[in-house]
Every structure is written in C-alpha cells, then in structure tokens.
Amino acid sequence: PEPPTACREKQYLINSQCCSLCQPGQKLVSDCTEFTETECLPCGESEFLDTWNRETHCHQHKYCDPNLGLRVQQKGTSETDTICTCEEGWHCTSEACESCVLHRSCSPGFGVKQIATGVSDTICEPCPVGFFSNVSSAFEKCHPWTSCETKDLVVQQAGTNKTDVVCGPQDRLRA
C-alpha cells in the first residue's frame, strides 16, 4: 500500500507512517514503528503539556514570584499551567499576570474616570473635545482647555486631547 501523506486527528506522520500523538499531560519517549505503538511518559512534578503532542520535554509550570507580588491562583496539573494572580490590592500588568502594579496610569490624552481600588484597577477615559491631559496619571481627570475669551485673549494655537490651547493678545487694529 502507498505510504500515507496525511494522518488522522491526534496522529502525526513520521518515517512514512502515522503515529499516535501523546495525550495532554504526557511527553514523547519514542515514535511508533511498524511493530510498536508511540511510547509516552507522564510529565513530572511541576511540569505540564496542555495539548495532544509529540514534545520530548514537558513545559515547566509558571513560577508565581512573591517578590513581584505574585501568588498562585490555581495550581498547575500535568495538563495545565499554574495561574498566577497578584496580592490583594495589586493588579496584574497583563493577562498573563507576570508582574504586579499598585494601579495603572492613564496616558496623556486620557483622564482618570475612576481611581483604582483594592479590587478594580484605574479606569481611564479619552479626553473629549475641549479637554486635555498632558501627563501620565493615576488620579488626574482631563482638564478643560483654558478659556482665552474670559482673559480677553484670543486662541493662538488650538488645543488637542494632550495639549491646552495657547492664548495670545488680540490684534489691535491701528487707526
């Protein structure tokens, strides 16, 4: 018979034959042959593989480093990685939660809608027309543009979401 060019799901092609992949939680020890099945071994303590695979090494569980404010939210198994979270009152810097911050800041062009609490991070909002923020801050709201008119001045440079307007003297028409 012709050697296969493609294999079924949960199989892989090697040496012109289809071998079974190792199930999650196990790593490949040896490929199958004409006479033997794929040989797999369970991952060791603190290791995992989360897919049907032909990996010869299991992945190490993530370490939740207490020096970075991390603690274990969910202990890893042979099939799943450890999930880290931050100490109470601190917030993950990313979905992967590799480090912790007290709270995030709102970038220039954004103002703070809600200051962080122990359970929720800073909520930012874009500065609308007529308002600006030129700083990165965890507490400052968007500031309204300066009103040149109330100072008997005119707008020399328009404001943006990151900059205030620039006021200047009115042009005096000479008689």
Epitope: G69, V101, S105, F139
Partner: nanobody
C-alpha cells in the same frame, strides 16, 4: 536601582499629628507622580493620597480629606505626608509609591499606631 525609604511613623494618641517622609533615590524624582498608600493589620491596601509630578494637583481619599496633606520637595527628592487629627482607624503601615507603581519598587513602609 529605584529605592523608596519611608520614615516618621510611630505611636501617637488620638488627635495627635505625625509627618511621614519618603526619601527617593535611583531615579529622577522631579516630574514623577507619587502616592501614599496604607495597609491596616489584616486589611487590604488603601490609596490615601497622591501628588502630581509638578506638585500642582493632589488627591485625597475621603477618609483623610481635611486631615492629611501631601507635599513634595524635589530639591531633596522627598515626599511628605502631614497627618493631623489622627484616629485609631489610621493605624496602618504607610508606603509611598512611584509610577509605574510596580510591586518590586515599593518601600518597606513605616508603621503608624494611633492609640491611647
């Protein structure tokens, strides 16, 4: 290396005052927004007060408004928290924090105990 060293805590009677300091080193202090946070025994972190990098804007938690004053001296690379009319519920370890407020940049804190 960023270092924040808090000091000025101690035991004080209700109604008394304390002034906390936070000496900063390892970064250009001027221009950085700074915060005071506190952690009471067995409780979570509470954000107490903040001051903008320019010193022109401040924030106070409702629980300390009118009693605490935050300030900074950029020439001394130091942040301050003047605490007046202290109450038992102000008892906590007080920490200062700088943007981006990473856990590994926090100081060791200074303990404030308000008790008669």
């Amino acid at each position: 290396e960023v270092q924040l060293l808090e000091s000025g805590g101690g035991l004080v009677e209700p109604g008394g005052s304390l002034r906390l300091s936070c000496a900063a080193s390892g970064f250009t202090f001027a221009g950085y927004e700074m915060w005071w946070v506190r952690q009471a025994p067995g409780k979570g972190l509470e954000r107490v007060s903040a001051i903008s990098g320019s010193g022109g804007s401040t924030y106070y938690a409702d629980s300390v408004k009118g009693r605490f004053t935050i300030s900074r001296d950029d020439s001394k690379n130091t942040l301050y928290l003047q605490m007046n009319s202290l109450r038992a519920e102000d008892t906590a370890v007080y920490y200062c924090a700088k943007e981006p407020y990473s856990f590994d940049h926090r100081g060791q804190g200074t303990l404030v105990t308000v008790s008669s």
